[in-house]
């Protein structure tokens, strides 16, 4: 209720002679700060004096000073919330009740705390899980109801007196709720730990023994078994007897059932610790073990491998791989059941013994077609020789051999002919299923392995075929040697290297790219007129009249081919210049006179220059010179000059006559 002081601290604290005690404590006074504090040992209330009697272990004065004899007991609290105490060292006679007498300005309170001090260090307490099973991780806990800042301790784990390798986790608590030291150890027990003693040892800071607690481990586990066999090597021949005995070396709890297994399968009606096998057969070869069960589960012994020996059985051959590709590697494996394993093998190819082959495997690194056939083998061990089995067939596959392309036509072949070719081969495995031809073309294949080229091209130089099964084998190309008329005939200017000017020496060449046969004739023509029969057409001094359209022809025994028409252009300076006058060479004054400079030039005239009868230059540069209004004094001879990139040309003089108008004559 609200009339009480509120305290929080452990109810009882434990320690031993010479150790210390740390009392975590908090409080809340009814009013104001703490003014007086006395720590009593076994306080008793005296009704007469209305005070508490008892041994005073600690007393605080108003000025906060503490008598020197009180150094063993320390008040570590404050005036409003902390009441923590320390007694160091603690003595046996400190056991009993501690009374905390608190006084504020108006209120008083007595708080009681139990202290249990033993003569010597008390043992820790080991806590185990309710059940421990082999190989299952468990946590072992060692708890000690003691912790004090002034007295360090340690907890150590031992198994059969030997420190345990596993790392323990130690924790301490010094709170108003609890005071303890705890060590936790994670541990996976094995069946062999059953019955062993685990100790938790309390030691001081120097590792000196203080006390301990021990427990015996009860590790539940499946039965642990040993198997014994007669004969001890477990190797027998057919008809011999074998005895196997099962012994239980440990079981917790006790075992309940026994059984025997062969190759992992339970043997019926075999539920005793002894297994007797009489007159064994090879089928009884295998791995035997006994199985004994308890409430935890079944336990199995190690396996005993019983070998019943016999002579090899009829052999079979396994081929890796068939069909085999020519040039690849092949491995033959002779398979024959026998015990002991065969020590010697005899190999046969198509019924004939293969010399020097005595191993279980035969390896042929590079298979050839003649390796095909039936392979069989015989196995042999110390008990005898087996029989030869049916054997296995090796199929050797290879590309078609000796492929050739054959021309069926009579020779020579001319451009435009129809050509038939056939593709032949010597042998093939598997059979040829298709043919390929190079180069590809839109050609007919009238039947398998036959190619028909309609209208053969001049450039169909060579043809090759391939016969194909799983692979294609190409024949060497055959030359068609197609004959054709000259091709790509063209006119080429050899000289001059630049543009042709009037008067230049000019050579034209008739070029062609190819001709078969090589022997050719040339013809030159201009405007349908034959000019020459050489490969070159030469002009010593070209004139503008030689300009025009030229063609050349090249022919051989197959036909003739013409070039495209080639235009010969001759550049020349302006020529044949003359001045024409409009409306005529006689004009009335005041009218307009137009003079035109006419010329022949290649390239055309770029500009003109006009001159009068005194060779004076007039400021006009176009083809026409317009005088308006024309005056009588403009009468006279005029001439023009034309200029192009080749040069200049001039006209002869042309006379313009300007006559007086009737008005002028009338005025005179």
């Amino acid at each position: 209720d609200s009339s009480k002081w509120v305290f929080e601290h452990p109810e009882t604290l434990y320690a031993w002679e010479g150790a210390c005690v740390w009392i975590p404590c908090t409080y809340r006074a009814l009013d104001g700060d703490l003014e007086s504090f006395i720590l009593f040992h076994n306080p008793e209330y005296n009704k007469n004096t209305s005070k508490f009697d008892g041994t005073r272990l600690y007393e605080s004065t108003k000025d906060g000073k503490v008598p020197s004899e009180q150094k063993r007991v320390q008040f570590l609290g404050d005036k409003n919330k902390n009441c923590t105490l320390s007694i160091h060292p603690v003595h046996l006679n400190d056991s009993g009740q501690l009374g905390l007498r608190m006084e504020s300005k108006t209120e008083k309170w007595m708080e009681r705390i139990h202290l249990n001090v033993s003569e010597r260090p008390f043992p820790p307490h080991i806590q185990l899980p309710p059940e421990i099973q082999e190989s299952q991780e468990v946590t072992l806990t060692c708890l000690l109801n003691f912790s004090c800042y002034g007295y360090p301790i340690q907890l150590q784990w031992l198994l059969e007196g030997v420190p345990m390798r596993q790392a323990a986790v130690t924790s301490t608590s010094l709170t108003i709720k609890s005071v303890f030291t705890r060590s936790e150890l994670k541990f996976s027990p094995q069946w062999s730990h059953h019955g062993k003693i685990v100790t938790c040892q309390l030691q001081d800071a120097d590792g000196k023994f203080l006390s301990n607690d021990t427990v015996q481990l009860n590790v539940k586990h499946t039965p642990k078994l040993e198997i014994k066999v007669t004969p001890s090597d477990a190797i027998v021949r057919e008809g011999d007897s074998v005895t196997m005995t099962c012994e239980v070396s440990s079981s917790n709890p006790e075992y309940t059932t026994v059984s025997w297994l062969k190759d992992g399968t339970s043997l019926k009606k075999q539920n005793t610790f002894t297994l007797n096998l009489r007159e064994v057969t090879k089928d009884q070869s295998g791995k035997y073990c006994c199985q004994v069960s308890n409430d935890v589960g079944p336990g199995r012994s190690e396996e005993v491998f019983l070998q019943v020996q016999y002579a090899p059985e009829p052999s079979t051959v396994q081929i890796l791989h068939s069909p085999a590709v020519e040039g690849s590697q092949v491995e033959f494996l002779c398979m024959s059941l026998a015990n002991p394993l065969p020590t010697n093998y005899t190999w046969y190819h198509n019924g004939k013994e293969m010399q020097g082959r005595t191993e279980e495997k035969v390896h042929i690194p590079k298979i050839l077609p003649w390796h095909a056939g039936t392979y069989s083998c015989v196995a042999e061990n110390i008990l005898g020789t087996g029989q030869r089995g049916p054997g296995a067939e090796l199929d050797v596959q290879y590309p078609p051999k000796k492929v050739t392309t054959v021309i069926q036509n009579p020779m020579p072949i001319r451009e435009g002919d129809t050509v038939t070719l056939s593709c032949n081969y010597n042998s093939s495995n598997p059979s040829v299923t298709r043919y390929e031809w190079k180069p590809h073309g839109a050609w007919e294949e009238p039947s398998l392995g036959v190619l028909k080229i309609q209208n053969v091209g001049w450039d169909n130089t060579t043809i090759a075929c391939a016969a194909c099964n799983s692979w294609c084998s190409w024949a060497s190309p055959v030359a068609l040697n197609v004959q054709y008329a000259p091709r790509d005939v063209r006119v080429r200017k050899i000289k001059p290297l630049s543009e042709i000017h009037s008067g230049n020496s000019v050579s034209l060449q008739c070029d062609f790219s190819s001709s078969h046969p090589k022997e050719v004739q040339f013809f030159w023509e201009k405007n349908g007129r034959l000019l020459g029969k050489e490969s070159q057409l030469n002009f010593d001094s070209i004139s503008p009249e030689d300009a025009g359209s030229y063609s050349c022809w090249v022919n051989n025994s197959i036909g003739q081919t013409a070039s495209k028409a080639w235009t010969l252009e001759v550049l020349y300076a302006p020529r044949r210049l003359r001045v024409s006058m409009s409306p005529g060479d006689q004009v009335m004054e005041g009218k307009s006179a137009t003079l035109t400079c006419e010329s022949d030039a290649n390239p055309p005239v770029s500009h003109y220059t006009w001159f009068d009868w005194n060779n004076q230059s007039l400021p006009y540069h176009s083809q026409k010179l317009r005088l308006e209004p024309v005056k009588v004094q403009h009468s006279g001879a005029y001439w023009c000059q034309g200029t192009n990139s080749v040069g200049k040309g001039r006209s002869p003089l042309s006379t313009l006559t300007v006559y007086y108008s009737p008005e002028t004559i009338g005025r005179r």
Epitope: H607, D612, N615, S617, L618, P619, S622, P629, G636
Partner: antibody, heavy 128, light 107 residues
Framework: QVQLQQSGPGLVQPSQTLSLTCVIS??????????WNWIRQSPSRGLEWLGR?????????DYAVSVKSRITINPDTSKNQFSLQLNSVTPEDTAVYYC???????????????????WGQGTTVTVS | DIQLTQSPSSLSTSVGDRVTITCRAS??????LNWYQQKPGKAPKLLIY???NLQSGVPSRFSGSGSGTDFTLTISSLQPEDFATYFC?????????FGQGTRLEIK
């Protein structure tokens, strides 16, 4: 160094005659390697060539079609000048008028071409 | 008449820029083409004559090229005093004609 000095009124009444003179110094109006030109400039028409006079054995004139019926360009050898007369003017003839020498001529053996290298200072003529 | 078309009609540029102005003739005029510079209130000044010849006293940053119908005036590195209007003119035949002009202004 060749110079051209223009003179003439800046204001002309409509339908009246515009008269401008260009005095040449440093060259001769009778030179056989030059032509003497009148050019005008207005915001609406830009630079517009009006005509020219030049001497090559005889005197010659060339006129722009747009003013052919109204224009006269005369050389005056005694004063070494040339003049422009433009009759029947209208406000459309308002412009800055320039005289200029154009180097284009000479003889067959000694020909020159160097463009309009010398210009007068310009006369602003307003018709109103 | 021979028409001369200049492009562009105006151009905003900065000092140091390279500038090219073109002039196209409506028919072939050989090389009878001249270039002029005009500043406000002043008469035109000859820069280039006969398409590619630099007039005496004109800075070498000005150059001209072309023949036939297509002509170019180039200013290799624009100076502050080059902001003006530029005209082309043909003397191939009468009437003598001018281009409409290209105005260069500071960006």
């Amino acid at each position: 160094q060749v110079q051209l000095q223009q003179s003439g009124p800046g204001l002309v009444q409509p339908s009246q005659t515009l008269s401008l003179t260009c005095v040449i110094s440093g060259d001769s109006v009778s030179s056989n390697s030059a032509t003497w030109n009148w050019i005008r400039q207005s915001p609406s028409r830009g630079l517009e060539w009006l005509g020219r006079t030049y001497y090559r054995s005889k005197w010659y004139n060339d006129y722009a079609v747009s003013v052919k019926s109204r224009i006269t360009i005369n050389p005056d050898t005694s004063k070494n000048q040339f003049s422009l007369q433009l009759n029947s003017v209208t406000p459309e003839d308002t412009a800055v008028y320039y005289c200029a020498r154009d180097g284009d001529g000479g003889s067959y053996y000694d020909y020159y071409y160097y463009g309009m290298d010398v210009w007068g200072q310009g006369t602003t003529v307003t018709v109103s | 008449d021979i028409q001369l078309t200049q492009s562009p009609s105006s151009l905003s540029t900065s000092v140091g820029d390279r500038v090219t102005i073109t002039c196209r003739a409506s028919q072939s005029i050989s090389t009878y083409l001249n270039w002029y510079q005009q500043k406000p209130g002043k008469a035109p000044k000859l820069l280039i004559y006969a398409a590619s010849n630099l007039q005496s006293g004109v800075p070498s940053r000005f150059s001209g090229s072309g023949s036939g119908t297509d002509f170019t005036l180039t200013i290799s590195s624009l100076q502050p005093e080059d902001f003006a209007t530029y005209f082309c003119q043909q003397s191939y035949t009468t009437p003598i004609t001018f281009g409409q002009g290209t105005r260069l202004e500071i960006k």
